[in-house]
Interface confidence: low
């Protein structure tokens, strides 16, 4: 027989199928030009010493063979003795190690069997009613196809699925979408309506994330507030990456889970922007404010579950940084300015009350005054900090108030609102004899003492009603008792106590009269 023809004789090896798992498979035969044809197949197993024979049986029952040698591809013309206009059955027999291995048969009409390509270009993936929809442009001159898909997860083998017949210049497929695991898909096509036509190769992998991105498992820590009024948020534990099917490992196209950090600044609610979303890799600096931090995982199908943490406010206070002057027109605060053109947010809330009761005010951008101070003033009518109680004040600063991560804490301190000098007057002043020339003066703590750092000292005044001489005695803010010595028996005295702040003298308590009785010796 000539090598270009199909040989209608018995093949040169015994007819004995070994039944082994290895051997030829995936036989595909196509017309590749007006008069030429090609069959190709794959061989599984050791290839040394293997000879391949393409077998063909015509509808008449006559059979022939082509000897391909060690090649797994063979071309022939329409003059090779194989009927191309009628149905033929083809298979491959491989002779190796004194045994024959056979491929599955394909039955087809060669003339109408066109080599079909898998989806070649961009494959669009979208979610449709809980399923996955893939769409692609039909390869040139190949309208009319059956399409199959296969898919696998990291822990499961390939499963085959059917996309149904396609008859348009775009083709699509509805596939199952996994809730919690990534999938790898491949697609293949074959000619529609051509009985026994061969499947194309499988397409390149299409990697699909799970419908729900994995919940991020991360931990944060926050550093101490620095001199600049900012503290760094650091990530203690990176989020775990998604497990991927074999064909998606490495580049993992399409299965990426992106983690974003959403910051919500709870303090200073009057600022323009309260939330900011950042890449997880770019850990921000925060002011000393309270924040909620959420880590949001998302993939191409949208956001998944998130994890939220609360970062409490830094309550370290600066008792001396703030000056407050109370006048008839209102109150003015002064503090060391940060820089030129800074916007300040002043936040205050009654001590011991829920954080939701915080009030704040945003200043217009301001430059330092000649003394290097920034100021904020309010009138009595505004009602701000008007009640006679202790307030916790925090001042934040930013040159870019619209950028959440550029705020810094200037200071945190306590302030007693309303008419502090009157409200702070000590009550229940009492005098007890202590010795022949001294008395003990006691009083109830001033309301100012409920406000950390506000009460600077008590002053006790003693007046000799005879000589009109007055003496004043400073007392530590933590003390509510003092001993007055060097008093004379039989003289009338009055005693008063006041409570002073760093910027305000208190109002004297009601005068308390006393005298030390003259001791008569027997």
């Amino acid at each position: 027989c000539r090598t270009s023809e199909c040989c209608f004789q018995d093949p040169p090896y015994p007819d004995a199928d070994s039944g082994s798992a290895s051997g030829p498979r995936d036989l595909r035969c196509y017309r590749i030009s007006s008069d030429r044809y090609e069959c190709s197949w794959q061989y599984e197993g050791p290839t040394a010493g293997v000879s391949h024979f393409l077998r063909c049986c015509l509808s008449s029952g006559r059979c022939c063979y082509f000897a391909a040698g060690s090649a797994t591809r063979l071309q022939f013309s329409d003059q090779a003795g194989v009927s191309v206009l009628y149905t033929v059955t083809l298979w491959v027999e491989s002779w190796a190690r004194n045994q024959t291995e056979k491929s599955p048969e394909v039955t087809l009409q060669l003339y109408n069997s066109v080599k079909y390509e898998p989806p070649l270009g961009d494959i669009k993936v979208s979610k449709l009613a809980g399923q996955l929809r893939m769409e692609w442009e039909t390869p040139d001159n190949q309208v009319g196809a059956e399409v199959q898909f296969r898919h696998r997860t990291p822990s499961s083998p390939w499963k085959l699925g059917d996309c149904g017949p396609q008859d348009d210049d775009t083709e699509s497929c509805l596939c199952p979408l996994e809730m919690n695991v990534a999938q790898e898909f491949q697609l293949r096509r074959r000619q529609l309506g051509s009985q026994g036509s061969s499947w194309s190769k499988w397409s390149s992998p299409v990697c699909v994330p799970p419908e729900n991105p994995p919940q991020p498992q991360v931990r944060f820590s926050v550093e101490q507030l620095g001199q600049d009024g900012r503290r760094r948020l650091t990530l203690k534990e990176q989020p775990t990456q998604l497990e991927l099917p074999e064909g998606c490992q490495g580049l993992a196209p399409g299965t990426e889970v992106t983690y974003r950090l959403q910051l919500h600044m709870l303090s200073c609610p009057c600022k323009a922007k309260a939330t900011r979303t950042l890449h997880l890799g770019k850990m921000p600096y925060l002011s000393g404010a309270a924040y909620n931090v959420a880590v949001i995982s998302s993939n191409q199908f949208g956001p998944g579950l998130n994890q939220t943490w609360h970062i409490p406010a830094d309550t370290h206070t600066e008792p001396v940084a703030l000056n407050i002057s109370v006048g008839t027109n209102g109150t003015t605060m002064y503090w060391p300015a940060r820089a030129q053109s800074m916007t300040y947010c002043i936040e205050w809330q009654p001590v011991g009350q829920d954080g939701g009761l915080a009030t704040c005010s945003l200043t217009a951008p301001q430059d330092p005054d000649p003394a290097g101070m920034a100021t904020y003033s309010w009138s009595r009518e505004s009602g701000a900090m008007g009640q006679e109680k202790c307030y916790y004040i925090t001042i934040f600063a930013s040159a870019h108030p619209e950028k959440l991560t550029l705020w810094s804490t200037v200071l945190s301190t306590y302030h007693f609102g309303g008419n502090a000098s009157a409200a702070g007057t000590p009550h229940h002043v009492s005098v007890k004899n202590h010795s022949l020339d001294s008395v003990s003066v006691d009083w109830a703590p001033s309301l100012l003492s409920t406000c950390p750092g506000v009460l600077k000292e008590y002053v006790v005044r003693c007046r000799d009603e005879d000589s009109k001489q007055v003496s004043e005695h400073p007392v530590q803010p933590t003390e509510t008792q003092v001993t007055l010595s060097g008093l004379r028996a039989g003289v009338a005295y009055t005693v008063q106590v006041r409570a002073d702040t760093a910027w305000l003298r208190g109002v004297w308590s009601q005068p308390q009269r006393f005298s030390i009785e003259v001791q008569v010796s027997d």
Partner: nanobody, 124 residues
Framework: QVQLVESGGGLVQAGGSLRLSCAAS????????MGWFRQAPGKDREVVGI???????????DYGDSVRGRFTISRDDAKSTVYLQMNNLMPEDTAVYYC??????????????WGQGTQVTVSS
């Protein structure tokens, strides 16, 4: 920053077609999902179509329920442009159409950058 400029809006009869374009400049176009959103008078902004960045030979798209099957979103990363092909337009498609860049989500709040918008009016 990303700057976005929309074009292609106008007046069209019901059943007709329009193609909107959105040209992006600035930060790398490929790193953002691009979306078309629309807002009719007195209504909230809603998603029309979104297209994620291309990964290998795959890119990901999604659509709002009311336009699925009629509108097609595509993007040309080489030209930093995203397109919206609108077929079989209906009067209820009348709105200002905005192009946006951001995360691949159907919620318009996830988009950091916005164009000025282009008016599409569909007459019956």
């Amino acid at each position: 920053q990303v700057q976005l400029v929309e074009s292609g809006g106008g007046l069209v009869q019901a059943g007709g077609s329009l193609r909107l374009s959105c040209a992006a400049s600035g930060r790398t176009f490929r790193t953002y999902a691009m979306g078309w959103f629309r807002q009719a008078p007195g209504k909230d902004r809603e998603v029309v179509g979104i297209a994620a960045w291309k990964v290998a030979s795959t890119y990901y798209v999604d659509y709002g329920d009311s336009v699925r099957g009629r509108f097609t979103i595509s993007r040309d990363d080489a030209k930093s442009t995203v397109y919206l092909q609108m077929n079989n337009l209906m009067p209820e498609d009348t709105a200002v159409y905005y192009c946006a860049a951001g995360a691949f989500r159907t919620d318009w709040r996830s988009y950091a950058y916005w164009g000025q918008g282009t008016q599409v009016t569909v007459s019956s």
